[in-house]
């Protein structure tokens, strides 16, 4: 019998350029008579153009929704009703070719052509894109709050905020031909639920989405987004009702930045420079293509690429890369944003050099990518350390912490977290090395203590980059480094002259002069520690709630002992900057550290002094008894303590704690406490210091109160942010 042909709606969006008309401001106002009149004419012309081609039989509907510069650009969509089997044959490219062919055929024609009655359409200025019914619905929902803006070269245009009576608005942005638009979004409120989507075309076409941002992101307080050309659309969707704009938008045209470099590397190890996508840290634009050619001076070296919060992975089944495609020596890799550092190591087998290509395969982009490049020795990629094949990083070996996700850095260790005697491979504890007393059979633990040694897991690196064998030589009163750098910055870690925490005891004034109380509206929220004249360190999770993210809320008290009263040694500060570790992950508690910059420097006194910061190589020996301090609850679920409490806890080996916590403990965490419970940090102690006393009498910051299961529960230790695991970030910020 007869079977009706199945017809489907195919939606197209696009723009065309009219050469004999000029854009005027009237055409930006949808309610103006000029707009209505121009729309009617343009719509008639568009319909006539489509029906003049063989597409005419499929024509369903069309709409011109906006105008722009150039001399006059019309933006439109149309729907064709086509047989299902012909769907793939009428791609946007085919439809564009048919319409261009029609326009070209009538350019020199003297015959009357309906669509040319009023308009001279430029065949080269016609663009047809794939769209969907959903895209048209999204577009229509913004038309009540539609803003067109043209931004000229050298201009920075601040866009007018959204109409709060509308639920959705669209900014249609256009710049000079051959330039690209750069949009800057700055969130101005701590909390909101607004959503902004940026598109690489004039309207909200899902397939041309560059990125979407949501709800006053604290991770990205400022976002800069690049379009691939001179047109862009931004769509706002209302969140919570607010009389204040939660964001500021500004746009400027920028020139295309070439992304091609030829470099010859020097004959030295470590980082030699930086490669980045155009306008870094702006989001890279759709259609970005970078090509970097690096020449290596000798086949002894390999090329290392060090990434920050970005990794390269093999992509299965040739799927497109959603976060950037890389080709390195004909290997295709996909970028992936992660909250970890990563290095890609490229073995060099020929002197021709290495070409690295980066391409944005889809319109969806992301934060600009920056990579440090340098050389490594192919025969010994990580001198004194272990090469973690999972992430390409050099990590300490046999230090008792599984730094490599597969744990191979702690496998096959003769001596784990101890010193291996040369004579017979016996292991002695690290504090016995270079302590003036031979413990190894032939005294190898006391050899080379006055000279430079190859750098390794437990060696201390001096400022001149040489290393010393003596563990933890910082601030012990005798210079071990040739340049004396182990005894610099040592005005720290000394207690004042002085005679919550579960199972603790009350502290006296000046006993813990680095202890900070972080308060909001007069209420103690978290602990912290003074580490420099203008910096207090604490836990990132103290600022987890959006309502706690603003610096203006916080007051920092130093020299405090009692919460309900003040004494002369006490001082308070406002916070000028709040920096969370860029890799902090709320769910896993990883990298749980934040830095607060005080509004003015501290004046040191017996009651206010900084704690000493350990070097990355500082070894806090498991078993060591250290102290935690804070005003946290004295029992699980209880109120905070009025007096500053102190309690001693024992440092626990990483592998044991990891097993007890079922492998939720990362290398940036350190465990301490008592198996019997009863002594532990509790709510309100968060961010407070875990400090250990060195033989010199100085106190070093080992950890920050981070998390745990309840407080003082038997079987569960307290988990702390391991300072040696985040010290490079701390030093980078503070110095």
């Amino acid at each position: 019998g007869y079977k009706a042909e199945v017809m489907v709606s195919q939606v197209y969006s696009g723009s065309l350029r009219v050469l004999n008309r000029h854009f005027s401001q009237d055409l930006t106002r949808r309610e103006s008579s000029a707009f209505r009149s121009e729309t009617a004419k343009a719509q008639k012309m568009l319909k006539e153009l489509i029906t003049s081609t063989r597409l005419g039989t499929y024509y369903n509907s069309s709409s011109v929704y906006s105008f722009g510069e150039g001399p006059l650009t019309c933006f439109f969509w149309f729907i064709l009703q086509i047989p299902e089997h012909r769907r793939l044959m009428l791609s946007p490219e085919v439809v564009q070719a048919l319409l261009v062919e029609e326009l070209l055929s009538t350019v020199n024609s003297s015959a009357a052509v309906p669509y040319r009655a009023e308009y001279e359409v430029d065949p080269e200025g016609l663009v047809i894109l794939e769209a969907s019914v959903k895209d048209i619905a999204a577009l229509n929902s913004t038309l009540g709050c539609y803003r067109y803006s043209y931004v000229g070269q050298g201009q920075v245009l601040r866009l007018k905020g959204p109409d709060h009576l509308a639920s959705s608005c669209l900014w249609h942005l256009q710049g000079p031909k051959d330039l690209m638009l750069k949009l800057r979004l700055e969130w101005t409120l701590a909390e909101c639920r607004d959503r902004l989507a940026m598109y690489d075309v004039a309207g909200p076409l899902e397939k041309r989405l560059i990125t979407s941002v949501y709800g006053c992101s604290r991770q990205e307080p400022v976002v800069e987004v690049l379009a691939s050309g001179a047109i862009m659309a931004v769509v706002w969707k209302k969140g919570l009702h607010s009389y204040y704009d939660p964001f500021v938008l500004s746009v400027q045209p920028v020139v295309f930045q070439a992304c091609e470099v030829n470099l010859t590397l020097d004959n030295r190890l470590d980082s030699q420079g930086v490669l980045s996508t155009p306008y870094f840290p702006s989001y890279y634009s759709p259609q970005t293509h970078c090509s970097w050619h690096l020449t290596v001076p000798s086949l002894d070296y390999g090329l290392a690429l060090w990434f920050d919060a970005y990794a390269l992975r093999r992509q299965k089944y040739d799927l497109p890369c959603t976060q950037g495609q890389w080709t390195i020596q004909n290997r295709r890799l996909c970028g992936l944003r992660i909250l970890q550092p990563y290095a890609e190591r490229i073995p060099v087998v020929a002197t021709a050099g290495i070409t690295i290509n980066f391409t944005s395969q889809i319109s969806l982009t992301g934060p600009g990518v920056r990579v440090h490049y340098g050389l490594y020795n192919q025969s010994d990629p990580c001198p004194g350390e272990f090469l973690c094949s999972v992430n390409g990083l050099c990590v300490p070996a046999c230090d008792g912490v599984k730094d490599c996700p597969n744990g191979l850095d702690e496998r096959n260790c003769v001596c784990r977290a101890t010193f291996q005697c040369k004579e017979d491979s016996t292991c002695i504890s690290l504090p016995k090395v270079c302590d003036g007393q031979p413990d190894c059979l032939n005294g190898s633990d006391e050899e080379q203590c006055q000279e430079g040694v190859p750098c390794g897991t437990f060696t201390f690196q001096c400022e001149d980059r040489s290393c010393v064998k003596k563990p933890n030589p910082q601030c012990d009163g005798r210079p071990d480094c040739r340049d004396g750098s182990d005894e610099e910055h040592c005005d720290c870690g000394l207690q004042g002259p002085s005679s919550r925490i579960v199972g603790g005891a009350v502290s006296s004034e000046g006993e813990w002069p680095w202890q900070a109380s972080l308060q909001v509206r007069g209420r103690h929220i978290c602990g912290g520690a003074l580490i420099a004249d203008r910096w207090v360190i604490t836990a990132a999770h103290c600022f987890q709630e959006d309502s706690m993210a603003s610096t203006v809320l916080w007051t920092v008290f130093l020299g405090k002992v009692w919460q309900n009263s003040r004494w002369p040694g006490e001082v308070s500060f406002k916070v000028s900057r709040l920096l969370l570790h860029p890799y902090h992950e709320e769910d896993s508690h990883d990298y749980d550290v934040a830095l607060l910059q005080l509004d003015h420097p501290v004046v040191r006194s017996a009651a206010v002094r900084p704690v000493c910061l350990p070097a990355r190589s500082h070894f806090f020996e498991p078993g060591l008894h250290c102290w935690i301090t804070g005003w946290g609850a004295l029992r699980e679920g209880g109120p905070i303590s009025n007096a500053l409490q102190k309690v001693d806890v024992q440092l626990i080996p990483q592998d044991l704690c990891s097993e007890v916590y079922r492998y939720q403990v990362t290398p940036r965490m350190l465990c301490a406490g008592y198996r019997k419970g009863k002594k532990d940090a509790c709510q309100g102690d968060s961010g407070g210091p875990l400090v250990c006393k060195a033989l010199s009498g100085r106190w070093f910051l080992a950890g920050l109160v981070s998390w745990g299961l309840g407080c003082g529960r038997p079987n569960y230790f307290g988990v702390y942010t391991r300072i040696t695991g985040v010290i490079s970030w701390i030093q980078q910020v503070v110095t």
Partner: antibody
Framework: QVQLVESGGGVVQPGRSLRLSCAAS????????MDWVRQAPGRGLEWVAL????????YYADSVKGRFTISRDNSKNTLYLQMNSLRGEDTAVYFC?????????????WGQGTLVTVSS | QSVLTQPPSVSEAPRQRVTISCSGS????????VNWYQQLPGKAPKLLIS???VVSSGVSDRFSGSKSGTSASLAISGLQSADEADYYC???????????FGGGTKLTVL
């Protein structure tokens, strides 16, 4: 490489005293709580006493409270058990044991034991 | 009379699996970590399991520990003749303020 070596055991008459020592090596003695555990011939294990890493806290089994004293000398890496008013039921092999990390209840290293015989 | 109760003896054939139980009360097992020791004839005890289930380094993974409420158990799979020994459970007791042991279980591999 952790080693615990007990000494001081022997035959002693009821009511008399004896002092046991335990020499420790291969670990940082001053960081760990230490215990004495005993085992009467053909019987099970019985905990005797515990001392905290710094000597500030001491715990005893009810059966020895008031008669035995646990102590330590961290400078000598040595643990002691002073046993006074000895009774026949104190006859046992006395083990010195090192607490695991976190203290109070897991003995990760034991000495070989020293035999104390209380007999007239 | 021990504070923690263990069966005096258990026996099983080689390559089989055996479980030794240890029961106590809220003040000990219910509130604290359980440890298991193996004592071979004429030797000092050796820590097998701490923290209810953490296998000590150097100990075969044929040994496993578990705890539920006020009871704990030690399981040994793939029994070998070398496993013949006395096995003790132990924990801290909050009421007695001290360490308590079970009476011990003699394991015989048939």
């Amino acid at each position: 490489q952790v080693q615990l070596v007990e000494s001081g055991g022997g035959v002693v008459q009821p009511g008399r005293s004896l002092r046991l020592s335990c020499a420790a090596s291969g670990f940082t003695f001053s960081n760990f709580d230490m215990d004495w555990v005993r085992q009467a011939p053909g019987r099970g294990l019985e905990w005797v006493a515990l001392i905290s890493y710094d000597g500030s806290k001491k715990y005893y089994a009810d059966s020895v409270k008031g008669r035995f004293t646990i102590s330590r000398d961290n400078s000598k890496n040595t643990l002691y058990l002073q046993m006074n008013s000895l009774r026949g039921e104190d006859t046992a092999v006395y083990f010195c044991a090192k607490e695991g990390y976190g203290g109070y209840d897991g003995f990760d290293y034991w000495g070989q034991g020293t035999l104390v015989t209380v007999s007239s | 009379q021990s504070v923690l109760t263990q069966p005096p003896s258990v026996s099983e054939a080689p390559r089989q699996r055996v479980t030794i139980s240890c029961s106590g009360s809220t003040s000990n097992i219910g509130n604290n970590a359980v440890n298991w020791y193996q004592q071979l004839p004429g030797k000092a005890p050796k820590l097998l399991i701490s923290y209810d289930y953490v296998v000590s380094s150097g100990v075969s993974d044929r040994f496993s520990g578990s705890k539920s409420g006020t009871s704990a158990s030690l399981a040994i799979s793939g029994l070998q003749s070398a496993d013949e020994a006395d096995y003790y459970c132990s924990t801290w007791d909050d009421g007695l303020n001290g360490v308590v042991f079970g009476g011990g279980t003699k394991l015989t591999v048939l």
